[in-house]
């Protein structure tokens, strides 16, 4: 009963984590323009993944497309990357555990094969977590920096000659979104690597057998022999997505105002 | 079409308020921010605030803060603007104007002469 | 506040001839997310309220004979009357609609000459 409802918890918590995850990477608000500290302006910026959005006090919005691909920065391909796989991983994950939450029957599945594909959903969703973790990271990552970069010009006066106003941008929305379905879709995948352990047959269908030795009888139960699966070399968390080293200007290039189209 | 309906000329004493209205027909009212602009005799334009009537969100101009109070009725799609503490100078034609995209205002009432004078 | 200088303060032009008045503001009104300038041109008639007539710089609101047009980018703007007429006579009032409070030039004075 309890690994039922583990499983089934840590479906229904896995699903909530995908839907969070999609929904982040769908978004718009991914960073936001910084309203501290700064003078108050009629017009308020804000951008996603795929889209930069501008939305005028008179509540009139206009969201532009990114239409480049070759044009844009290369953390911003990577948090896309990241994101889909999650979304990719995670749909699978969904696709595969369904068939084997405990309370769908199917034929005449077996507990191991059950135990085999809760493990590998379990898998995916931990992965598809860390991506999604991983995505949102890199991107606030990329914000900081570009903060930080856009402060010291807006003191510095390194911006004499740009005629536009320094926009500064912050943790949008979107973020915690995904940080928080990220973190929901690996939780998940733990409570079905969790479940998995208990749906994989603990004893062999042996009979026990007496054997009765001179003074005393003592009865020995072959058992413990846990069903292999198969996963074990996979059990620990590969190491999803290496950015690799990069230079300051490469990590710098990402532009402060975002204008990819 | 679009029509912004002021309230009547009024004439005040030093200190006391105004309140002057303006009623919106012709579209959504909640759809569009109010702004409230003065002119004062053969002088430029000031704006003084906003207010977004479908939430009641509310923008000032610092320099009027604490004496102009911007309101919205949406039943009867109208705008208040009311200024206490009169002063003569601010003996002024006072306008509402509805803000369209681009944050300018496209439709503006015919505006009320408001003469403060002891 | 932004200040919005206008200039020339009053224009004389002969019917048929090209007006241009100047518009320049304290600090950039071109925004970086849309790359839209945040500055309108309103005319104005004696006795009348103000008609808006260019908005985001360049953009020309609908009904506006094309003989207007706006230019400029950042902090320095212009209203082009390429050919005057008699019931152009009026003043023109730049407005900041970037940058809270939202502030209008001082004017200027369009007359027959």
């Known amino acids: 009963m309890a690994v039922t409802a583990c499983q089934g918890l840590g479906f229904v918590v896995s699903l909530i984590g995908i839907a969070g995850i999609i929904a982040a990477t769908c978004m718009d608000q991914w960073s936001t323009q910084d309203l501290y500290n700064n003078p108050v302006t009629a017009v308020f910026n804000y951008q996603g993944l795929w889209r930069s959005c501008v939305r005028e006090s008179s509540g009139f919005t206009e969201c532009r497309g990114y239409f480049t691909l070759l044009g844009l920065p290369a953390m911003l391909q990577a948090v896309r990357a990241l994101m889909i796989v999650g979304i990719v991983l995670g749909a699978i994950g969904l696709l595969v555990s369904i068939f084997a939450l405990k309370c769908i029957r199917i034929g005449s599945m077996e507990d191991s094969a059950k135990a085999n594909m809760t493990l590998t959903s379990g898998i995916m969703f931990i992965v598809s977590g860390l991506c999604a973790i991983a995505g949102v990271s890199v991107f606030a990552n990329m914000l900081v920096t570009n903060f930080w970069m856009s402060t010291a010009n807006m003191y510095t006066g390194m911006g004499g000659m740009v005629q536009t106003v320094q926009t500064r941008y912050t943790f949008g929305a979107a973020l915690f979104v995904g940080w928080v379905a990220g973190g929901l879709t690996l939780i998940g995948g733990v409570m079905m690597c969790i479940a998995c352990r208990g749906l994989a047959p603990e004893e062999t269908n042996y009979k026990a057998v007496s054997y009765h030795a001179s003074g005393h009888s003592v009865a020995y139960k072959p058992g413990g022999f846990k069903a292999s699966t198969g996963f074990g070399s996979n059990t620990k968390n590969k190491k999803i997505y290496d950015g690799g080293a990069r230079t300051e200007d490469e990590v710098q290039s990402y532009p402060s105002k975002h204008d990819y189209v | 079409q679009v029509q912004l309906v002021q309230s009547g000329a009024e004439v005040k004493k030093p200190g006391s308020s105004v309140k002057v209205s303006c009623k919106a027909s012709g579209y959504t009212f909640t759809n569009y921010l109010i702004d409230w602009v003065r002119q004062a005799p053969g002088q430029g334009l000031e704006w003084m605030g906003g207010?977004?009537?479908?939430?009641?969100?509310?923008v000032y101009n610092e320099k009027f803060q604490g004496r102009v109070t911007l309101t919205a009725d949406k039943s009867s799609m109208t705008a208040y603007m009311e200024l206490s503490s009169l002063r003569s100078e601010d003996t002024a034609v006072y306008f509402c104007?509805?803000?369209?995209?681009?944050?300018?205002?496209?439709?503006w009432g015919q505006g009320t002469l408001v003469t403060v004078s002891s | 506040d932004i200040v919005m200088t206008q200039s020339p303060d009053s224009l004389a032009v002969s019917l048929g001839e090209r007006a241009t008045i100047n518009c320049k503001s304290s600090q950039s009104l071109l925004n970086s997310g849309n790359q839209k300038n945040y500055l309108t041109w309103y005319q104005q008639k004696p006795g009348q309220p103000p008609k808006l007539l260019i908005y985001?710089?360049?953009t020309r609101e609908s009904g506006v004979p094309d003989r207007f047009s706006g230019s400029g980018s950042g902090k320095d703007f212009t209203l082009t009357i390429s050919s005057l007429q008699a019931e152009d006579v009026a003043v023109y009032y730049c407005?900041?609609?970037?940058?809270?409070?939202?502030?209008f030039g001082g004017g200027t004075k369009v007359e027959i000459k």
């Open positions: 407005q900041n609609n970037y940058f809270y409070p939202l502030t």
């Open positions: 104007a509805r803000r369209v995209r681009g944050n300018s205002f496209d439709s």
């Open positions: 207010i977004n009537p479908g939430s009641g969100d509310t």
């Open positions: 985001w710089a360049s």
